[in-house]
Interface confidence: low
């Protein structure tokens, strides 16, 4: 997946640091105090729709087959710049019963972006 | 996630049957001959952006916090109707060396849709 560098307007990954204090979650998240969540931004012209690289799922591949052949309704489906690979991060936090829990939380960090 | 019923134009899951013969994959996929892949369709107005229900990832929730507060650049990010839960299915197929393989293939079936 592309990294946004200010020169491209094609779907790419943009660096973004989330501060848990900013969003008021520092009362239940113990550590870390924030993290590089990143996000996806950019255009998805028809010729790159469904081309989310290594992370392209079976389903995306199938739908893209129909889309490329102009099959209704996929030819008109809006293609979106979305996370195609997310990674896990360890967190220390209070659960509902105020126990301190350490857990690997999935889908925290956007690693790659692609067009749906 | 909503099921599309023809009455709503909000992001929902649409039933769709994929025929492997249709897309020319019946020469390597032995079974099944097709499956209900489904897909996502519909509008994502700002008030439901990031509200993909039970499948809402940590990342989506975080970004939505910023979006709801009008934080640039998220306030202007295009929200998309995308799969938020995909499931696995068993397949019997020929691999690259023409061996018959049975495998659970992830991300084959769209189970739920939501707004990114």
């Amino acid at each position: 997946g592309l990294e946004c560098d200010g020169k491209v307007n094609i779907c790419c990954k943009k660096q973004f640091f989330v501060s848990f204090k900013d969003i008021g979650w520092n009362d239940w998240i113990i550590a870390p105090s924030g993290y590089h969540a990143n996000y996806c931004e950019g255009e998805c012209p028809s010729h790159i729709a469904g081309t989310s690289g290594s992370s392209l799922s079976f389903h995306s591949t199938v739908i893209n087959h129909y889309r490329m052949r102009g099959h209704s309704p996929f030819a008109n489906l809006k293609s979106c710049c979305i996370p195609t690979k997310l990674s896990t991060m360890s967190m220390l936090y209070f659960d509902d019963e105020y126990n301190i829990v350490k857990r690997d939380v999935p889908n925290m960090i956007v690693e790659e972006c692609g067009c749906s | 996630g909503l099921e599309c019923d023809g009455k709503v134009n909000i992001c929902c899951k649409k039933q769709f049957f994929v025929s492997f013969k249709d897309i020319g994959w019946n020469d390597w996929i032995i079974a099944p001959s097709g499956y209900h892949a489904n897909y996502c369709e519909g509008e994502c107005p700002s008030h439901i952006a990031g509200t993909s229900g039970s499948s809402l990832s940590f990342h989506s929730t975080v970004i939505n916090h910023y979006r709801m507060r009008g934080h640039s650049p998220f306030a202007n990010l295009k929200s998309c109707c995308i799969p938020t839960k995909l499931s696995t299915m068993s397949m019997l197929y020929f691999d690259d060396e023409y061996n018959i393989v049975k495998r659970d293939v992830p991300n084959m079936i769209v189970e739920e849709c939501g707004c990114s």
């Epitope: 870390p32 360890s90 220390l92 301190i100 350490k102 | -």
Partner: antibody
């Protein structure tokens, strides 16, 4: 760089109250995201957590010491204090103050130099 | 109450690798922290959140934590590394320390 320094009497009589103060320099005790802690080490033994306090006054104590411990904070002086009452010889130890790091509870860094308190008549 | 168990002592020759263990029930589900104590000095945090090294701590210090055991590893041990090492974890809202391990560099 934040530094912590313990102060208080080095000798306390049995049954009396042990009082120590930790002065924080190089940073404000009112900064959110830290808990200010007391930890002790008995002679030749391991570390024992006593308790900690937030700048707003929320306290958490070691259950085994809870009935005898009070930790308080004075943001105007950038200090926090420990009071341990009804002391016995078993309370003889080096007492450290430390900052619990993280947005809330996390790891202890930095620590003070420690002060030896002996309980004896 | 929750307990963390460490070996009382570990010996190592200079330049060799020293491993100090810390055991506790499902310790791998918690974060482990390690502190170095030298006589007359302030305790120093050497590893936090299982395997992260604070700035200023040499790269020879590393940590791991899984199952019931956290391990502090010092590779290429130097004479200056001789000290007492304590592991720490959280049990609910309570801090628990191990009994400490005396590292001797022969």
């Amino acid at each position: 760089q934040v530094q912590l320094q313990e102060s208080g009497p080095g000798l306390v009589k049995p049954s009396q109250t042990l009082s120590l103060t930790c002065t924080v320099s190089g940073g404000s005790i009112s900064s959110g995201g830290y808990y200010w802690s007391w930890i002790r080490q008995h002679p030749g033994k391991g570390l024992e957590w006593i308790g900690y306090i937030s700048y707003s006054g929320s306290t958490y104590y070691n259950p085994s010491l809870k009935s005898r411990v009070t930790i308080s904070v004075d943001t105007s002086k950038n200090q926090f204090s420990l009071k341990l009452n009804s002391v016995t010889a078993a309370d003889t130890a080096v007492y450290y103050c430390a900052r619990a790091y993280g947005d809330y509870r996390g790891w202890f860094d930095p620590w003070g130099q420690g002060t030896l308190v002996t309980v004896s008549s | 109450s929750y307990e963390l168990t460490q070996p009382p002592s570990v010996s190592v020759s200079p330049g060799q690798t020293a491993s100090i263990t810390c055991s506790g029930d499902k310790l791998g589900d918690k974060f482990a922290f390690w502190y170095q104590l030298k006589p007359g000095q302030s305790p120093v945090l050497v590893i936090y959140q299982d395997n992260k090294r604070p700035s200023g701590i040499p790269e020879r210090f590393s940590g791991s934590n899984s199952g019931n055991t956290a391990t502090l590893t010092i590779s290429g041990t130097q004479a200056m590394d001789a000290a007492d090492f304590y592991c720490q974890a959280w049990d609910s809202s309570t801090v628990v320390f191990g009994g400490g391990t005396k590292l001797t560099v022969l």
